[in-house]
Structure formats: structure tokens, C-alpha cells
Interface confidence: low
């Protein structure tokens, strides 16, 4: 047929790997298009097959799978480099097709350069510790389906540009560093570098992730409101502008969604007749505890407003907390007038 | 462009103390390893410590002793403190990039390196 | 402890010459060498790193080969600005390492 479904470019998966390394990419039909697997496919007499357009190229291109060593190869639903090289660069197609179907997706593949140390642009997963939680433990991530179970590679982790030994509390275990009890000092970049031989060769994988050190949800309170408070009176007369600040201490929890909103007489401000505005701000801490600020504010104050009742609300995965801002309308000072008499003294 | 210049040699007397300086120029210091080797007249060259900024130092076995790496990441300085010199640790001293320990580090920026003479 | 040594010591080559240096590593260090060029009063330059790799900026006439405990350094033709000490240096090994680089090899032009 003429027609093939295309899916276009789907730049949500924009595959970074490393230069002079092995990778392995599963078409993405499978995973997120189709809801039939490669051996469904393959065993209804579909074909898949593989093209690409390099770099700052218009052309679509057939993949030589004829390099020496094999360099790129498929199998199954996976094409792979051993290893990759800087110009594979580019758009990747995987169509999968007989006479009567077709259908195929695009993917954006970039090969990054590493320096000495590590770096370079790979987008880095975080993984987030709890401070002074006790045993917590990294993976090296995405190395399944390199090599067969047979194969016992060698791991090495670093922190940074440093191999991991003798570190007071931190312990390769294989694929798992392990961390005995974290603290900030352990924020930073760790890298595995798999080692695993394959028909006579060599081959190595790296892999870098960010751990994040955050509060631990043995300290984690409900939401703690620091303004405002019973200590301050917002004493305007008419006309005046009136901002109350609305701050809230969040500990960090994992997924937690922290809110924090304003009430008017118990209702939404947007659902009040008034001219009133909200700012917010967020500030987090070093373990990701977040203070939010939201500052209500109406320009011109009316007596009527001055007598409504504002109270903050915050809410998180570990409850709901309110606080009520203490609003006054200022009683005007008496005005003294001096009323001059005809004489000073008795008579 | 990132640039290393040490400073802080000197003619000192056996037993004596020196502090030797290295400035990096461009992104922070706490970014990088940095190592300092030395080579002494005519010789080779010869690792002495590095450090690995927050995380942690490495020195060779003669210098754990008498010489102390540190850094102050705010002014991007590495320190090399050089305490109870010997004629032997007569050397041009040299900071450089980069690190030990994976199947690909090597050091990739060089200081001028400067020169301490220990002699009485 | 690695210990690496190299040959020969010093050598002495006419320009245009094809020149090799050789660096053994007492037990093996995968592809973790790199070597380095010094000229007199000079710091090291980086020339391959990872065995084989040129930093960007080194003449392609330089070229490492070489895994596990044998190594060489190879300039294709050599030019009047070759003359200097290369020394191989290992990054196989952190901690105690007592000295990561070979004894050196001095380049001289005839």
C-alpha cells in the first residue's frame, strides 16, 4: 500500500548516548504506538525495518548494516551500535509494514562527547536520598539487555571524577552504591562505568545520575503557617493599600503537592466583587524543604473589606492547615483643637 | 578558556614551610580535579596530591605526611601546603586538570608551574 | 602499584622519520594511558588519552595504540618541533598511587 500511518517525530524521546559505546534503541512502535508487541507483528508477516536521516540532512538513508565488526546491527525490535560514533547523530525511522499495512515513528538520537571527568550535555537523571534516613541504595541504571546473564561485568563508581573507595559512607556493591547514611555533602554527579567483554572485545557503558540529598520523612510535619500570626494586627484606614503575606513551610515529601490559597469570607478571592491580586513566591531549602510565599493585596481598601475575614490555607501530603490574618480598620487619633479664650488668667 | 597559573615558590630553608597557590581562571573550581605533580631538576615528573573539591583528597604515600592540598572554591584557589621541606622536594611545581581513576582520565590543562628550591 | 616503564630512554631521529615509543604497565590497565609531550621549561601537554584519542589541537601525525600492559606512541613523520621528553601516564589506578607516570623517553633531532 501507499499509505503509511506516520507518527511523525517523536521528540519525547530524544535519545542521548554516548559517544564510543554500545547502544541499544527499541523501536518506539511497540512501546508507545501499537497495542501489539514485535513477536505479534513478526509472526502476522510484518517486516520492520530501519532508515535514518543524518544531521543537518534532508535525506532519508538506508542503515548499512554492513560495517566491519557489525558496528550496527538489528535484532528483533532493537538497533544496535558496537559502539556508537559521533556522526550516527540524527533521525532515526523504524516502519514497521506488509502489502496491505504500514506504519512508523521517527526519534531524535544524539551521541554526546564525555570529557575526562564525565560531563557533557547528557540530560541527567535525578535520584533523590533522604537525609540521614539510614541504607538507601542507587542502581546503575539502564543496562539490562547488554549482555546475558553469563557475563559477570566489572562496575566502577565514581563521585565526580573520583573511583569510589574508601569512602567513609558510601559502598559499591556491584550495580548498587550504597549509601550508609547520606548528608548533603553526598549531593553531586555518580557515574557507573559497566566493563563487560563481548567476542573478543572490550566494551564499556557509563552512566551518571544527580543524587539530590532531601529531608527525611521521619522529620516531615504538616504544613506550618509563619505568617500570619497572632503577633501582627494589619491596621489600614480606607484607601490604604493592605498586603498580607501568606507564608508556609512545606518539608519535603516525595510527590507531595504543596498548596497554599487564600479565602476571603470563606470564599475564593476570584469569587469575591473586590480588586484583589495574589503574588507567589517559592524558596527551597538545601534537603528541598519549600517555603511559599503568597502575598494578598488589594491597592485601595474599603472599610467594608477591612471587616471581611482573610485566612490562609496550606495543604500537603501530610495535612491541611489554616491561619486566620488578625485585619483592623485604624481608628482615626482625636484631633485636639485649641479654642482660644478672650482672657488667659482669672479676672 | 580556562587557564591554571600557580604561584608562591620560593627559596626556603631545610625544615621550613611554603604555601604554593593555584589559580583557575574561567568556570568554578569546585567543577574540576585538580592534581599537582612536581619535577625536580632533570627528573621526571612526579604526582603529589589531588583534590577532588567537597568530595575528597588523594595524596602519593611520601607526601601524606608533610603536604596538605586544600582549596577555597569562593577565590577558585588550590592550596598546596608544604610543611618540614627537604633539599629533595627541590622541584617545579606544577597544577593541572583533570583526575586518576577511570580507564580515561588524564590531565588536559597544565599551570606554568613555579619553583621551590629548599636549601640552606 | 602500576609501574610503568618505558623505552627506549632517549633516541635520536632524523625529520621525516617514523618514530615509536613503548610503554609497558606492570599489570594491565585496559586502555587507561595517555601521553604527554614537555618541552625544557615547559608544562606537559596532553597528546592521546584513553590509549588512542587525540585531544583536539595535537597533529594527526601523532598516534597511540595498544591495550592491557603494552602501549605505544607513533609520530608518523617527525617534524624539528618534535624534539622533546614524552612520558606515558597511567589513569588506571586512584588512592596510593606512588607515581603514575613512566621514567620519560627524550626525542632528539638529528
Known amino acids: 500500500s501507499e499509505r503509511c500511518d506516520d507518527w511523525g517525530l517523536d521528540t519525547m524521546r530524544q535519545i542521548q548516548v554516548f559517544e564510543d559505546e554500545p547502544a541499544r534503541i527499541k523501536c518506539p512502535l511497540f512501546e508507545h504506538f501499537l497495542k501489539f508487541n514485535y513477536s505479534t507483528a513478526h509472526s502476522a508477516g510484518l517486516t520492520l525495518i530501519w532508515y535514518w536521516t543524518r544531521q543537518d540532512r534532508d535525506l532519508e538513508e538506508p542503515i548499512n548494516f554492513r560495517l566491519p565488526e557489525n558496528r550496527i546491527s538489528k535484532e528483533k525490535d532493537v538497533l544496535w551500535f558496537r559502539p556508537t560514533l559521533l556522526n550516527d547523530t540524527g533521525n532515526y525511522t523504524c516502519m514497521l509494514r506488509n502489502t496491505t499495512y504500514c506504519s512508523k515513528v521517527a526519534f531524535p538520537l544524539e551521541v554526546v562527547q564525555k570529557d575526562s571527568c564525565f560531563n557533557s550535555p547528557m540530560k541527567l537523571p535525578v535520584h533523590k536520598l533522604y537525609i540521614e534516613y539510614g541504607i538507601q541504595r542507587i542502581t546503575c541504571p539502564n543496562v539490562d539487555g547488554y549482555f546475558p546473564s553469563s557475563v559477570k561485568p566489572t562496575i566502577t563508581w565514581y563521585m565526580g571524577c573520583y573511583k569510589i573507595q574508601n569512602f567513609n559512607n558510601v559502598i559499591p556493591e556491584g550495580m548498587n552504591l550504597s549509601f550508609l547514611i547520606a548528608f548533603i555533602s553526598n549531593n553531586g554527579n555518580y557515574t557507573c562505568v559497566v566493563t563487560y567483554p563481548e567476542n573478543g572485545r572490550t566494551f564499556h557503558l557509563t552512566r551518571t545520575l544527580t543524587v539530590k540529598v532531601v529531608g527525611s520523612p521521619k522529620n516531615a510535619v504538616p504544613p506550618v503557617i509563619h505568617s500570619p500570626n497572632d503577633h501582627v494586627v494589619y491596621e489600614k484606614e480606607p484607601g490604604e493599600e493592605l498586603l498580607i503575606p501568606c507564608t508556609v513551610y512545606f518539608s519535603f515529601l516525595m510527590d507531595s503537592r504543596n498548596e497554599v490559597w487564600w479565602t476571603i469570607d470563606g470564599k475564593k478571592p476570584d469569587d469575591i466583587p473586590i480588586d484583589v491580586t495574589i503574588n507567589e513566591s517559592i524558596s527551597h531549602s538545601r534537603t528541598e524543604d519549600e517555603t511559599r510565599t503568597q502575598i494578598l493585596s488589594i491597592k485601595k481598601v474599603t472599610s467594608e473589606d477591612l471587616k471581611r475575614s482573610y485566612v490562609c490555607h496550606a495543604r500537603s501530603a501530610k495535612g491541611e492547615v489554616a491561619k486566620a490574618a488578625t485585619v483592623k480598620q485604624k481608628v482615626p487619633a482625636p484631633r485636639y483643637t485649641v479654642e482660644l479664650a478672650c482672657g488667659f488668667g482669672a479676672t | 578558556e580556562v587557564q591554571l597559573v600557580e604561584s608562591g615558590g620560593a627559596l626556603v630553608q631545610p625544615g621550613g614551610s611554603l604555601r604554593l597557590s593555584c589559580i583557575v581562571s574561567?568556570?568554578?573550581?569546585?567543577?574540576?580535579?585538580i592534581t599537582w605533580f612536581r619535577q625536580a631538576p632533570g627528573k621526571g615528573l612526579e604526582w603529589v596530591a589531588t583534590?577532588?573539591?567537597?568530595?575528597?583528597?588523594y595524596y602519593a604515600s611520601w607526601a601524606k605526611s608533610r603536604f596538605t592540598i586544600s582549596t577555597d572554591t569562593s577565590k577558585n584557589t588550590l592550596f598546596l601546603q608544604m610543611d618540614s621541606l627537604r633539599a629533595e622536594d627541590t622541584a617545579v611545581y606544577y597544577c593541572?586538570?583533570?583526575?586518576?581513576?577511570?580507564?580515561?582520565?588524564?590531565?588536559?590543562?597544565w599551570g606554568p608551574g613555579t619553583l621551590v628550591t629548599v636549601s640552606s | 602499584q602500576i609501574v610503568l616503564t618505558q623505552s627506549p630512554a632517549t633516541l635520536s631521529a632524523s625529520v621525516g622519520d617514523r618514530v615509536t615509543i613503548t610503554c609497558q604497565a606492570s599489570?594491565?590497565?585496559?586502555?587507561?594511558l595517555a601521553w604527554y609531550q614537555q618541552k625544557p621549561g615547559k608544562a606537559p601537554k596532553l597528546l592521546i588519552y584513553?590509549?588512542?584519542t587525540l585531544p583536539s589541537g595535537v597533529p594527526s601525525r601523532f598516534s597511540g595504540s595498544g591495550s592491557g600492559t603494552e602501549f605505544t606512541l607513533t609520530i608518523s613523520s617527525l617534524q624539528p618541533d618534535d624534539s622533546a621528553t614524552y612520558y606515558c601516564?597511567?589513569?588506571?589506578?586512584?588512592?596510593?598511587?606512588?607515581?603514575?607516570f613512566g621514567q620519560g623517553t627524550k626525542l632528539e633531532i638529528k
Open positions: 599489570e594491565s590497565i585496559s586502555t587507561a
Open positions: 584513553k590509549a588512542s
Open positions: 593541572a586538570r583533570g583526575g586518576v581513576g577511570s580507564s580515561w582520565k588524564a590531565f588536559d590543562l
Open positions: 574561567g568556570p568554578s573550581l569546585s567543577h574540576f580535579d
Open positions: 583534590i577532588s573539591p567537597g568530595v575528597s583528597t
Open positions: 601516564q597511567q589513569g588506571f589506578s586512584s588512592g596510593n598511587v606512588h607515581n603514575a
